[in-house]
């Protein structure tokens, strides 16, 4: 074998080895990349698992909270079921009282009689909140409504049926305040204002009674 042939063989072998080396380097690089990718995936998976565990924990807490709320609601419903309605049918409930707006027009005494027959009295306004409610309730109507405020003659103070005096800060009685009528002077509310009038005249009326706010 000649020297030139040996040289050719060595060159070929070298080229072979270089190719093998590059191939191996490529494989090693690919494996490293795969390992890195695998590590990244593993880290991502770990994070996902942690996030899911955290969310699951939060949801468990929410579920527990909802369960307690549900129990409370069930308890409330039981209590409500044991309560009768605060007001009879057709009466309007507001605060501590029930109100009935009459469908008939009568004089003051007849109106009082109607309320008494329903275990109620004529309207008494105790506060500005009561007044606001009544004004709003009758705002649809232009009719006068008798209330439980009256006096025998102008020298007497305005008194509610229960004997208590009218609080001057609530409202001012307008109209025939200085007139004397044989049947007395009674107050009615119309379009949000309160007027004095002969008790013998006919008007609608508002009955009032305490709401049943106690459990059975």
């Amino acid at each position: 074998m000649q020297l030139s042939q040996v040289s050719d063989l060595l060159t070929q072998e070298q080229a072979n080895l270089t190719h093998q080396k590059k191939k191996l380097e490529g494989q090693i690089s690919a494996r490293q990349q795969a390992e890195e990718a695998s590590q990244e995936s593993e880290n991502e998976l770990k994070e996902m698992i942690e996030t899911l565990a955290r969310k699951l924990n939060e949801k468990s807490k929410e579920q527990m909270e909802l369960h307690h709320q549900n129990l409370n609601l069930q308890e409330t419903l039981k209590r409500v079921a044991n309560c009768s309605a605060p007001c009879p049918q057709d009466w309007i409930w507001h605060g501590e009282n029930c109100y009935l707006f009459s469908s008939g027009s009568f004089n003051w005494e007849k109106s009082q009689e109607k309320c008494l027959s329903l275990d109620a009295k004529l309207l008494k306004i105790n506060s500005t909140a009561d007044l606001d409610f009544i004004q709003q309730a009758i705002s649809y109507s232009s009719f006068p409504f008798w209330m439980g405020l009256s006096r025998r003659n102008p020298s007497y103070p305005w008194l509610w049926e229960d004997g208590s005096p009218l609080m001057p800060h609530l409202f001012r009685v307008r109209g025939a305040v200085s007139q004397t009528y044989p049947s007395g002077t009674c107050a009615y509310i119309q379009r949000g204002a309160v007027y004095a009038e002969n008790c013998i005249l006919a008007a609608f009326s508002i009955c009032q009674k305490k709401a049943n706010l106690r459990a059975q």
Epitope: Q112, L116, G163
Partner: nanobody
Framework: EVQLVESGGGLVQPGGSLRLSCAAS????????MAWYRQAPGKQRELVAH???????GYADSVKGRFTISSDNAKNTVYLQMNSLKPEDTAVYYC????????WGQGTQVTVSS
Amino acid sequence: EVQLVESGGGLVQPGGSLRLSCAASGSIFTINAMAWYRQAPGKQRELVAHLTNSGRTGYADSVKGRFTISSDNAKNTVYLQMNSLKPEDTAVYYCNRLGLHWSWGQGTQVTVSS
């Protein structure tokens, strides 16, 4: 106008009883409702009990089950039977119609004290 005269008050021990009377100078038969009121010193007058001409009665929560209102229309008299009296029942008691009140009488003093 009808005049009213209340009587029957007095000093009584807690747990005791009294019967108040109210004599009217005119007919109470046609009145929708007669009532007993009371006023303690420094307090507003309050409705204690009422009796309608159809026989319905109404009582303040504080006296329910202890006080009874009744009337004798023939005598134009209204009564208030007060049992199981308490110190907080101490007041001057008045009778009058329920609403469209007549002139108030002198009232009758009820004192509950040991």
